[in-house]
């Protein structure tokens, strides 16, 4: 089951119409928020959650501050989440850092990682 923070993030990003991810704009059969949220790939949701956490952890995103925060970002939450977080950071840490340092939005970073793909079946 998806955690409430996933839904909160998805809602926040859906409201940000100007910078929304192209795949968020694709409405589901009912065209409702829940369907759209569920259509997001799990990796994309993970990415949004981590990038937003990192943003909150640093006053100003620099190579130094973000790389320091990146070592701590996966330390909170349930162990299953920590494993997902660590696996994601192992794969994308450098690139996420670069995006944050350059002032990219969470959506831009996660889209650029080609994670903005609707899932093929139920999560």
């Amino acid at each position: 089951r998806l955690s409430p923070e996933y839904y909160d993030l998805a809602r926040a990003h859906l409201r940000d119409e100007e910078k929304s991810c192209p795949c968020l704009a694709q409405e589901g059969p009912q065209g409702d928020l829940l369907t759209k949220t569920q259509e997001l790939g799990a990796d994309y949701r993970t990415c949004l959650t981590i990038v937003q956490k990192l943003k909150k952890m640093v006053d100003k995103p620099t190579q130094r501050s973000v790389s320091n925060a990146a070592t701590r970002v996966c330390r909170t939450g349930r162990s299953a989440w920590r494993d997902v977080c660590r696996n994601f950071m192992r794969a994308y840490q450098s690139r996420v850092t670069q995006g944050l340092v350059a002032g990219e939005t969470a959506q831009q970073i996660c889209e650029d990682l080609r994670l903005c793909i609707p899932s093929t079946g139920p999560l």
């Epitope: 910078k19 620099t62 190579q63 840490q93 690139r95 850092t97 670069q98 350059a102 002032g103």
Partner: antibody, heavy 123, light 111 residues
């Protein structure tokens, strides 16, 4: 080929403002941040700040923040720097330089520079 | 701010010899096993030109006689063999901390 074409020399009175431009061509404007660097006559290089044309994010060197405004126009692929409340200390050459948002776009440094705009402040 | 100290401030080298320029940072500029230190060459009346990025990567189109090394706080730019066109001022620059900073520059002259 990549080109950063800067506007012509500026003469200004103390207290006035100047706005310089940097027209980018030969690459995808939104895949690079645009940095600005100051060089006083016979002196070294000083980093002013950068703008991300993709997100509009700006990062300023605290030393320049109060009197400097960086903007960018995606449609014309042009970056701008405005300096206000000019003093003789602002007399310098101002360079724009691109920097990739992600390291796989190119060398992760300021790899192309404009020719510079000379600003002279005198009464 | 991360302070970059270049040495020497100037040096004179004979054609064909080695020029070594040092850059010391007030704190480490490393993360993820990478060093966020770059080297530029500037000739009078011209903009700086990227030579080396992330400590040791040679920029495309730059002759192989230029090389960079170092990590953490100590970095070196080597030019060997020095050619006439290498007479210029060389700057190191870090992009690890905010604000980005440049070294004071090293002026290379030919004997």
């Amino acid at each position: 080929q990549v080109k950063l074409q800067q506007s012509g020399a500026e003469q200004a009175r103390p207290g006035a403002s100047v706005k310089m431009s940097c027209k980018a061509s030969g690459y995808t404007f939104t895949k690079y941040t645009m940095h600005w660097v100051k060089q006083r006559p016979g002196q070294g290089l000083e980093w002013i700040g950068f703008i991300n044309p993709n997100s509009g994010y700006t990062d300023y060197n605290q030393k320049f923040k109060a009197r400097t405004t960086l903007t960018a126009d995606k449609s014309s692929t042009t970056a701008y720097i405005q300096l206000s409340s000019l003093t003789s200390e602002d007399s310098a050459v101002y360079y724009c330089a691109r920097y990739p948002i992600y390291s796989d776009y190119g060398p992760y440094a300021m790899d192309y520079w404009g020719q510079g705009t000379t600003v002279t402040v005198s009464s | 701010d991360i302070e970059l100290t270049q040495s020497p401030a100037s040096l004179a080298v004979s054609l064909g010899q080695r020029a070594t320029i040092s850059c010391r940072a007030s704190e480490s500029v490393d993360s993820y096993g990478d060093s966020f230190m770059h080297w530029y060459q500037q000739k009078p009346g011209q903009p700086p030109k990227l030579l080396i990025y992330r400590a040791s990567n040679l920029e495309s189109g730059i002759p192989a006689r230029f090389s960079g090394s170092g990590s953490g706080t100590d970095f070196t730019l080597n030019i060997h063999p020095v050619e006439e066109e290498d007479a210029a001022t060389y700057y190191c620059q870090q992009s690890h901390g905010d604000p980005y900073t440049f070294g004071g520059g090293t002026k290379l002259e030919l004997k």
